[in-house]
């Protein structure tokens, strides 16, 4: 598609005259009829099969013909044609004398000619005009011509169309042969696809438009090369999508196990040092005079019952002071100036004479002790409790009360990690002492067989275009999921180009 | 225990400002990437900014880019969220979550409210 | 944007009922789905991630299932606790895009 434009310059007819010889009346008004049809090696009448156009009256006798000629006529004049030009053509210009306003060929007397030109020859498409003169014995014609492309329309024949566009379909302007020349920022047959932001990930990122990078899912960061942990991971971090592995002191699956309870919480008070003794549990070994799980308590002097034999203690500033009862002196009444017969035994204690009846020794029953039998027994000062378990008296006997993570008499058992059931998808759990382990069915990895993984569908690469590819753990085959403008079960077709 | 807990959030005329933080705790904050998603009254949910962990990249949704800045102090334990030229449709409640633009948001916060309006 | 439609928006089921809420998504999501559920005043709560897995501490009645762009949350027997707004979001494509909700009341 494209225009044969004729640009009508000068015409000359001095004496005024038509064809025929005779002399218009009063001057020869003219305009010219353009004809423009296939080549011909001999012009001959006939259809105009190229186009025709005719113009105005242009002027008197001679007169130079204007760009854009007023009166409602164009110049250059226009012959638009709809089909791949042929490289060739045949053109006839006539001027004609029009005695009244009516200029249709029925209305013109066949002797108003004054004059007709027909040339032939080849014509390649170009912005350059050609310039001609046609000379006869009375008029002389100037004027240039050239053929141009339509717009949207390029190549030597203007049979190319181009539409540059900016859209969702493409992002380019037409070269002079008609090619697509991408905008900048784009790539591909049509310009659709973005060129993605310098050093963005090949498999992990993609992007939407030029310089961007975004990540696919499981990836972070400015080039998509950087992976975001587990969701449930509390204090790791990943090496690939989903890992949680743990930071230093945090252990279990999702590293939300405190194995350095001491750094982290400092639970021991006093100047206590602290002892890191599993998850979550720890133990506090107090400085002289303090108490406690965590050594919160300050310890009286006299909260170890130093006094012997029913002795009460003073607490002072430098210590104690232990008052003896009658029969009992030392620093912690431990002599005694008693015998049996002062019946010096509680708690239905039987009395034996020592040394010729010089002193005595008291056998107590269960619970009691002491040299008098005076003492309850304190069955948790042996410290039986593990794991940090907590001591308590209940009456003959004692319990413990254990620390998150323990159980049994003595809080000397882990807790299972298995009891919840942690695997998913299937994987049998083991119960370690680092915390548990699960063993994963086929197509499942991860801490807790919680991540799918390919069996092996993918390893051939089958999808192409950067495609990413999955398998579809129903049927071990792989599923492409194409990036944007492509199709296909690998994603091997461009969109808008199906398979051939 | 993961707690995120959101702060800034009042009534704010039309074209003004807001700076809205959230403090986290119960995670090594530093490891993962955070973001802020709205809930105007009555309505869905919807993504507004993201920030990475590994180099501090962002992303916005449209309506609020150049209006709104995500940004993170991880020695703070702290994500904020700064926006300005405020308008109507911007009122909602501003939830701070764990999470990035292409992963769940696995914790999120109790929520601040804003609202714009003359 | 990647458009979520839920359906129904809104539902009256008992307890111990069945539920089922469906999420579709207007182009290919592969499993990149998550499911939330929001209680009034409330924030929204993880449920579901990568379409099945459920997050931690959530009971086994819950559970998801689907791919590409038709997905399913299953609430096997129905508790007076799940009576809430239920959401789902993609994170496949950006920006992430969430679903308008279902609301699941009392009947």
């Known amino acids: 598609s494209g225009v044969f434009q004729l640009q009508l310059q000068e015409f000359v007819n001095e004496r005024g005259v038509l064809a025929s010889g005779r002399p218009c009346e009063p001057g020869c008004r003219t305009f010219f009829r353009v004809c423009l049809k296939h080549f011909q090696a001999v012009v001959s009448p006939g259809p105009c099969t190229f186009g025709s156009v005719s113009t105005p009256v242009l002027g008197t006798n001679s007169f130079a013909v204007r760009d854009d000629s007023s009166g409602g006529g164009r110049n250059p004049l226009q012959l638009p044609f709809n089909f791949t030009w042929p490289g060739t053509f045949s053109l006839i210009i006539e001027a004609w004398h029009a005695p009244g306003d009516d200029l249709r060929p029925e209305a013109l007397p066949p002797d108003a000619l004054i004059s007709k030109i027909a040339i032939q020859g080849s014509l390649a498409v170009g912005q350059n005009w050609l310039l001609d003169e046609q000379t006869s014995t009375l008029t002389r014609l100037r004027y240039s011509y050239r053929v141009i492309c339509s717009d949207n329309y390029y190549g030597d024949n203007c049979s190319r169309l181009c539409k540059k566009r900016n859209d969702h379909f493409g992002h380019y302007v037409c070269q002079p042969d008609g090619n697509l020349s991408c905008l900048p920022g784009w790539t591909g047959e049509y310009c659709q696809q973005p060129i993605c932001l310098s050093g963005c990930h090949e498999q992990n990122g993609y992007c939407s438009k030029p310089a961007e990078c975004l990540c696919r899912p499981g990836w972070q960061g400015r080039l998509c090369n950087e992976c975001i942990p587990h969701n449930g991971c509390r204090h790791g971090t990943c090496s690939t999508p989903w890992q949680c592995t743990c930071d230093e002191g945090w252990g279990g699956l999702f590293c939300d196990q405190d194995l350095n309870y001491c750094t982290h919480h400092s639970p021991c008070k006093n100047g206590a040092t602290c002892s890191n003794s599993g998850q979550r549990s720890y133990t506090c070994t107090c400085r002289p005079g303090y108490t406690g799980v965590d050594c919160e308590l300050e310890l009286s002097e006299c909260d170890s019952n130093p006094c012997r034999n029913g002795g009460s203690c003073k607490d002072q500033e430098d210590g104690y002071h232990c008052l003896c009862p009658p029969g009992y002196y030392g620093l912690h009444c431990e002599h005694s100036t008693l015998s049996c017969a002062d019946s010096p035994c509680f708690n239905g204690g039987s009395c034996r004479e020592r040394n010729q009846g010089a002193s005595y020794a008291c056998e107590c029953p269960p619970n009691f002790t002491g040299s008098n039998c005076e003492k309850k027994v304190d069955r948790c000062t042996s410290n039986p409790c593990a794991n940090g378990g907590q001591c308590l008296n209940r009456g003959p006997s004692r319990m413990c009360r254990c620390r998150p993570g323990f159980t049994g008499t003595y809080c000397e058992r882990h807790v299972s990690d298995c009891a919840r059931n942690p695997c998913a998808h299937g994987g049998t759990c083991h119960d370690l002492e680092s915390g548990l382990m699960c063993t994963c069915p086929a197509g499942f990895s991860g801490r807790r067989c919680e991540v799918r993984t390919s069996i092996d569908a993918c390893a051939s690469s089958p999808c192409f275009n950067r495609a990413t590819c999955y398998t579809d753990l129903s049927t071990d085959t792989f599923v492409c999921n194409c990036p944007y403008g492509f199709v296909g079960s690998r994603c091997e077709f461009p969109v808008g180009l199906p398979p051939s | 225990e993961v707690q995120l807990v959101e702060s800034g959030g009042g009534l704010v005329q039309p074209g003004g400002s807001l700076r809205l933080s959230c403090a986290a705790s119960g995670f090594t904050f530093s490891n993962f990437p955070m973001a802020w998603v709205r809930q105007a009254p009555g309505k869905g949910l919807e993504w507004v900014a993201t920030i990475s962990s590994s180099d501090g990249t962002t992303y916005y949704r449209d309506s609020v880019k150049g209006r709104f800045t995500i940004s993170r102090d991880n020695a703070k334990n702290s994500l904020y969220l700064q926006m300005n030229s405020l308008r109507a449709e911007d009122t909602a409640v501003y939830y701070c979550?764990?999470?990035?633009?292409?992963?769940?948001?696995?914790?999120w916060g109790q929520g601040t409210l804003v609202t714009v309006s003359s | 944007d990647i458009q979520m439609t839920q359906s129904p928006s809104s539902l009256s089921a008992s307890v111990g009922d069945r539920v089922t809420i469906t999420c579709r998504a207007s182009q290919d999501i592969y499993y990149n789905l998550a499911w939330y559920q929001q209680k009034p005043g409330k924030s929204p709560k993880l449920l579901i991630f990568?379409?099945?897995s459920l997050a931690d501490g959530v009971p086994s009645r819950f559970s998801g299932s689907g791919s590409g762009t038709d997905f399913t949350l299953t609430i096997s027997s129905l508790q007076p606790e799940d009576f809430a707004t239920y959401f789902c979001?993609?994170?496949?494509?950006?920006?992430?895009?969430f679903g308008q909700g279902t609301k699941l009341e009392i009947k």
């Open positions: 979001q993609q994170y496949d494509w950006y920006p992430p895009t």
């Open positions: 990568d379409t099945s």
């Open positions: 979550a764990r999470g990035y633009y292409n992963s769940p948001f696995a914790y």
